[in-house]
């Protein structure tokens, strides 16, 4: 029975050339988190594994940093980084929980953080 919910940073914006922290938090479940995947569309950015720690995909090594916590920091942002990002929590015994974040990378300096929201 999957009872948990994922809270994410929601819709966020950041400036080109800057950095942003993607954060998800799993609550309302006692399930054990065995691994968290960070994905952009169907591309794997990084993995945080309970046994092995962090693994950053080679193609993102220069611009992705692990943390804080189970979150992910994207650096040297470009407009091409605009899009959907997903945190996938692999848990036992519940299974898979997915959170969605939409990032907009702006040319100007008017970047603002969106409201937090929950995904059941």
């Amino acid at each position: 029975m999957m009872t948990g919910t994922i809270e994410t940073t929601g819709n966020i914006s950041a400036e080109k050339g800057g950095s942003i922290i993607l954060q998800c938090h799993l609550s309302s479940t006692t399930a054990q988190v065995t691994q968290v995947n960070w994905e952009q569309q169907d591309q794997l950015l990084a993995i945080c594994n309970a046994d092995l720690g962090w693994h950053i995909s080679p193609s993102f090594k220069d611009r992705v940093a692990p943390g804080p916590g189970l979150g992910l920091t994207l650096q040297s942002l470009t407009v091409n980084d605009t899009g959907e990002y997903f945190c996938i929590y692999h848990t036992y015994p519940d299974g898979t929980y997915t959170g969605r974040i939409f990032l907009e990378v702006l040319e100007s300096s008017v970047a603002e953080h969106g409201a937090r929201f929950q995904i059941p």
Epitope: T34, L44, I47, A50, D51, T96
Partner: antibody
Framework: EVQLVESGGGLVKPGGSLKLSCAAS????????MSWVRQSPEKRLEWVAE????????YYPDTVTGRFTISRDNAKNTLYLEMSSLRSEDTAMYYC????????????WGQGTSVTVSS | DVQITQSPSYLAASPGETITINCRAS??????LAWYQEKPGKTNKLLIY???TLQSGIPSRFSGSGSGTDFTLTISSLEPEDFAMYYC?????????FGGGTKLEIK
């Protein structure tokens, strides 16, 4: 080339025990979670155990919890399945399989070892 | 547990044809369904995972679609080596569960 080779199967009486092994080669064994899956004589597949890359976490379905124990020796690149209190319904071909690094599905399987539980 | 119903259990087709195999989950499993091929004397092969992602090294004539409860494996322009047993498996929720299999034979 990734290779998984199971061994240790055989004929055992109900209530008996058996320990299966799976020798892994061609990849960094200690970086991957591993599973055991069995296939009944009727060709139905059933997942029976899983272990995390470092061996800290183990998972089982209710059908085998308390009777089966999955373990691994990363120094020997070997996965194990210890089975006790065996029942006739445990008769199957047992496969070890590697989980994808991203945890989505099992990307490599062994050829299997046969276990028959009968008096 | 999530029950997976796979259909048909048997399918006869000719090389060059396009076929589809379906799997239905007893509850939503998001996109988390995998497809495997089983052939005598060979180890099981992962074809598709996460519903539609093609495993590395698998020919593009294999494709997967669906989300929620209904999923489809499509094999277009069947090759002689495609005649085999196919299984789906949900990887959304423990315990991982499999469909009953589809035997694809040459007509």
């Amino acid at each position: 080339e990734v290779q998984l080779v199971e061994s240790g199967g055989g004929l055992v009486k109900p209530g008996g025990s058996l320990k299966l092994s799976c020798a892994a080669s061609g990849f960094t064994f200690s970086s991957y979670a591993m599973s055991w899956v069995r296939q009944s004589p009727e060709k139905r597949l059933e997942w029976v155990a899983e272990i995390s890359s470092g061996g800290s976490y183990t998972y089982y379905p209710d059908t085998v919890t308390g009777r089966f124990t999955i373990s691994r020796d990363n120094a020997k690149n070997t996965l194990y399945l210890e089975m006790s209190s065996l029942r006739s319904e445990d008769t199957a071909m047992y496969y070890c399989a590697r989980k994808r690094r991203d945890y989505y599905a099992m990307d490599y399987w062994g050829q299997g070892t046969s276990v028959t539980v009968s008096s | 547990d999530v029950q997976i119903t796979q259909s048909p259990s048997y399918l006869a087709a000719s090389p060059g044809e396009t076929i589809t195999i379906n799997c239905r989950a007893s509850k939503s499993i998001s996109k988390y369904l995998a497809w495997y091929q089983e052939k005598p004397g060979k180890t099981n092969k992962l074809l598709i995972y996460s519903g539609s992602t093609l495993q590395s090294g698998i020919p593009s004539r294999f494709s997967g679609s669906g989300s929620g409860t209904d999923f489809t494996l499509t094999i277009s322009s069947l090759e002689p080596e495609d005649f085999a047993m196919y299984y789906c498996q949900q990887h959304n929720e423990y315990p991982w569960t499999f469909g009953g299999g589809t035997k694809l034979e040459i007509k």
